[in-house]
Structure formats: structure tokens, C-alpha cells
Interface confidence: low
């Protein structure tokens, strides 16, 4: 159910609080590895580690992707895997920034509508459902960066080019400036700055804090959002329970959201969906007559 | 503040077709459902049809399947009805209308409307 | 279709007292989230038409409070519970439950 929708791998670099941060290149436990005379030693990490055929998977997605995608042809997926390895191999995996990522960021200019632009928090699956029937709507994970990274892990290991397969830094345990942190961060504060007119975002009415100020929306797009261009943020919060007819727009969190957003200059709107099943369904099919009563 | 503002009035000839606009300000567009309601001189109301930008595909009543077109320009924030094969029974003010509901993403909830469009089919 | 049918046809009413209009639909508007898909608006001379109350019971903002609706499934009910002069108009019911929407025939409210 929508309870279990979680957003997954597009890792929340910030969910934990500040005092997070001080993590630096200490943390890890040094373990034996190998064998013979001189063992070598690598870093131990709280979290996962590289996804398994990583290179191969960025490679396949990017050729896969620019073959789906016309305007995005001229790309070469070797250069793009060779800017996007250069961003973290040979590099201290608690020691990456958002510089290190400048040139893949360069090979993955792509121009989408920036009025068609769909932001989500804790709800992808149902989000990249959307966009899927909605075509001409975007999530991140529907251009071509997002699309390679999206569900992946990865990290390499200081002063030598191997990719860790054993373990990756976590955010809040071992430290914030990792390598998958640091690429959401800059494609997401991208994305959200790409933005115009009327942005929309997508947010799990069944969490406890609907808008979450620690999560990606909440600490980078929000922030992220040029109020010279955007003229308004209207959230769409997606209810769980099927009996469930509160107006979530009234959440103390959305008003929250709405009072940051209402700062920037930027008006706000919120809309609750009611039964995501009818939503998408509705999507997929206007004409249907129940489509005209609540979803 | 939300407001519509509708093109003027129409005077045509059975047969014609009118396109008529309504265009929004004052608020998001693309996500609220526009419909477009008619009435006919000292005669009810009658739900024509309806968007909702976003999706793009419009709903309409049967009884006007086929000689209604609804569409709407997002980079505007208008919405057009245009109804073609014109007779002297669809001489009506033709009025957008739009919902402002946080409760239902659909038809219906008619917060704001147009000022009307009166079109007269004569020959 | 779902036909909507009101009465009376016209109503005149003298200010400061209440009055009532009916409204009966040919099926349930009664939805399985408990929400009754019925509107009411209130269409002023020369004006366009403005909305009173929404899901069957729930005034819309602005709508004075002496403005109430209730009812549920097919027989639903508006109550002025004291007219005033700028209540004068042609009162319709709307069901928003399915498509096509559907208007009842109107109401004309005049002063006596």
C-alpha cells in the first residue's frame, strides 16, 4: 500500500539533523582484505555498498535512455560513464562535492519543460507512475541523470581507483558529503532551479510529517525554486487509507510548506488525492464517467 | 484573486461554428478542472463539458459529443469551447467555470466563473 | 443522466422570514466516502452564477450563514433561514457526482 512508499534509494542525504555533519574522513573501521605478505586495508561503512555492476548499469541505462529520447542522441555514454567515475574514484568517499560532479552535470544538459516539472517526497513510485502515463510531465528520474542514478549506490575508496562493493558511507552515520548524497543534492537543487509557472509536487499524506523540511524537497528543490520564474507550488497530497477523507491541506506541515514557499514569494496551492488508484486510472482514461467524482 | 475573463459577444450563422475563450488569472491553471455551462434565454443552466489542463483530455456531456471541442493553452492559462454545426437553439450565454477545490480533483465546486458570452445563431 | 428535479418552481418570500427550496435526484449522490455530491447556486439578475454550498452541507466562503443545506442520498434541502432583498434570484441544484454534471430546473426567489 501507499504506507510502504518510501523514497527508496534516491538517498535522503539530509534526513538526519546538523550535529550529522562533523562526520568526516575518521569515520569507518579499517578491516584486513586480500591475502599475501602486505594486507591491504579498506574502509568499513555503515552503508550498502556499490550496487552490483555498476558500470555496466550507468552505461546500459545512458544508451538505453538516449535511444528513447531523440533530443538526447548526440550524448556519448562513454564520456558520460568516464565524467560520472570521475567524480568519485581515487577521491575519499566522505570528501566529494558538488565540483566533483561539474563535468558529468555538463554532459547531462537536457532541456525539459520547465512547466511540466513534478517534484515528490517520499512517494516516488507512485510519482514515476504519473509521469509514466502523463508524458509530458517530468520527474528528476525521468531525465537523463535521474535515470541513471536512480536506486543506485556507489562510492570508491581514496588514492585508488577500485569501486567499494563492500560498503558505502551512510548519511547520517558515517558522513553527509558522500557520493550519492552529494550527486541528488546538485541534480536535484538543478532540477528544482530549472523550474517555471506552476510546479508540482507530489507528497505521501500517510507519513507522519507530510512536508518534511530534512528531506530533498524540504532542504534543497523548496529552497531551490526561483520565485522570478515559479509563480506557484501546488502540492498534491496522496492519501493511503481508502475511508480516509480529512483535508490534509490543512496539516500542520503543509502549512509549514506553505508559509516557507509564501516567503520565497512563490503562491501556494494544495490539492488532496483521495484514491490514487483512481487518480492514475483517471489519468490514463479523462472520459470515464466516474472520473468526474472524487479521487 | 482568481478571475476568469471570457471573449465577447457572437453573432453567427447556422452551420458556423464559435470558438470562445476564457482566460485565468490570479491563480494555478493546469491542475483545476475549467467547464464551460450554457443558458439559453430565460432557460436553466446545462453542463457542456470540462479540462483539467494538466491531463489535457476532456470530458464532455453526450449530448454534445461530437460538436463541442474543449482544449486549453497552459503557456496562456486560457481554455477554449469551440461548438461547431451551429442552429438557433444555441443561442446562449456561454459561461467557463472553475473549481477551487482542495476537496476533489474534478468537475463540480464552481468557485469562480466567467462573465458570460452571449452568442446569438441567426441567419 | 442523473435528472435533478426542484420545487417549488418559484418561491416568493417575504424578508425576515425563512424559506426553503427542495431538490430530488434520480439516484444517490451519496458517494462511498461519505460526501454527498450535491451544489447549490444562487444566480442573481443580469449576474453569473455563484456558488452557495458544496457537498451537500458545506457553505462556500462568503456565503452568509443563514444560507444552510442538508440532506443526503436523493432529497436534499436549501434553507434561507431569513430572507433579505439581495437573496432575490433563480436558485439551481447541481449533482457533481458523475458526468454529465446535471442542473435542477431553478428556483425563482422574489420578494412578495
Known amino acids: 500500500g501507499l504506507n510502504d512508499i518510501f523514497e527508496a534509494q534516491k538517498i535522503e542525504w539530509h534526513e538526519g539533523s546538523h550535529h550529522h555533519h562533523h562526520h568526516h574522513h575518521g569515520s569507518g573501521s579499517l578491516v584486513p582484505r586480500g591475502s599475501g605478505s602486505v594486507p591491504r586495508w579498506r574502509q568499513q561503512w555503515s552503508g550498502p555498498g556499490t550496487t552490483k555492476r555498476f558500470p555496466e548499469t550507468v552505461l546500459a541505462r545512458c544508451v538505453k535512455y538516449t535511444e528513447i529520447h531523440p533530443e538526447m542522441r548526440h550524448v556519448d555514454c562513454q564520456s558520460v560513464w568516464d565524467a560520472f567515475k570521475g567524480a568519485f574514484i581515487s577521491k575519499h568517499p566522505c570528501n566529494i562535492t558538488e565540483e566533483d560532479y561539474q563535468p558529468l552535470m555538463k554532459l547531462g544538459t537536457q532541456t525539459v519543460p520547465c512547466n511540466k516539472i513534478l517534484l515528490w517526497s517520499r512517494i516516488k513510485d507512485l510519482a514515476h507512475q504519473f509521469t509514466q502515463v502523463q508524458r509530458d510531465m517530468f520527474t528528476l528520474e525521468d531525465t537523463l541523470l535521474g535515470y541513471l542514478a536512480d536506486d543506485l549506490t556507489w562510492c570508491g575508496e581514496f588514492n585508488t581507483s577500485k569501486i567499494n562493493y563492500q560498503s558505502c558511507p551512510d548519511w547520517r552515520k558515517d558522513c553527509s558529503n558522500n557520493p550519492v548524497s552529494v550527486f541528488w543534492k546538485t541534480v536535484s537543487r538543478r532540477f528544482a532551479e530549472a523550474a517555471c509557472d506552476v510546479v508540482h509536487v507530489m507528497l505521501n499524506g500517510s507519513r507522519s510529517k507530510i512536508f518534511d523540511k530534512n528531506s530533498t524537497f524540504g532542504s534543497v528543490e523548496v529552497h531551490n525554486l526561483q520565485p522570478e520564474k515559479v509563480q506557484t507550488l501546488e502540492a498534491w497530497v496522496i492519501h493511503g487509507g481508502r475511508e480516509d477523507s480529512r483535508d490534509l491541506c490543512q496539516d500542520p506541515t503543509i502549512k509549514e510548506l506553505e508559509s516557507i514557499i509564501s516567503k520565497r514569494n512563490i503562491q501556494f496551492s494544495c490539492k488532496n488525492i483521495y484514491r490514487p488508484d483512481k487518480f492514475l486510472q483517471c489519468v490514463k482514461n479523462p472520459e470515464d464517467s466516474s472520473c468526474t467524482s472524487e479521487i | 484573486q482568481v478571475q476568469l475573463v471570457q471573449s465577447g459577444a457572437e453573432v453567427k450563422k447556422p452551420g458556423s461554428s464559435v470558438k470562445v475563450s476564457c482566460k485565468a488569472s490570479?491563480?494555478?491553471?493546469?491542475?483545476?478542472?475549467i467547464s464551460w455551462v450554457r443558458q439559453a434565454p430565460g432557460q436553466g443552466l446545462e453542463w457542456m463539458g470540462g479540462?483539467?489542463?494538466?491531463?489535457?483530455?476532456?470530458n464532455y456531456a453526450q449530448k454534445f459529443q461530437g460538436r463541442v471541442t474543449i482544449t486549453a493553452d497552459e503557456s496562456t492559462s486560457t481554455a477554449y469551447m469551440e461548438l461547431s454545426s451551429l442552429r438557433s437553439e444555441d443561442t446562449a450565454v456561454y459561461y467557463c467555470a472553475r473549481d477551487s477545490s482542495s476537496w476533489y480533483f474534478t468537475y463540480g465546486y464552481f468557485q469562480h466563473w466567467g462573465q458570460g458570452t452571449l452568442v446569438t445563431v441567426s441567419s | 443522466d442523473v435528472v435533478m428535479t426542484q420545487s417549488p418552481l418559484s418561491l416568493p418570500v417575504t424578508p425576515g422570514e425563512p424559506a426553503s427550496i427542495s431538490c430530488r435526484s434520480s439516484?444517490?449522490?451519496?458517494?462511498?466516502?461519505?460526501?454527498?455530491?450535491l451544489e447549490w447556486y444562487v444566480q442573481k439578475p443580469g449576474q453569473s452564477p455563484q456558488l452557495l454550498i458544496f457537498l451537500g452541507s458545506n457553505r462556500a466562503s462568503g456565503v452568509p450563514d443563514r444560507f444552510s443545506g442538508s440532506g443526503s442520498g436523493t432529497d436534499f434541502t436549501l434553507k434561507i433561514n431569513r430572507v433579505e432583498a439581495e437573496d432575490v434570484g433563480v436558485y439551481y441544484c447541481?449533482?457533481?457526482?458523475?458526468?454529465?454534471?446535471?442542473f435542477g430546473g431553478g428556483t425563482k426567489v422574489e420578494i412578495k
Open positions: 490570479g491563480g494555478t491553471f493546469s491542475s483545476y478542472a
Open positions: 439516484q444517490s449522490l451519496l458517494n462511498s466516502n461519505g460526501y454527498n455530491y
Open positions: 479540462i483539467i489542463p494538466i491531463f489535457g483530455t476532456a
Open positions: 447541481m449533482q457533481a457526482l458523475q458526468s454529465p454534471l446535471t
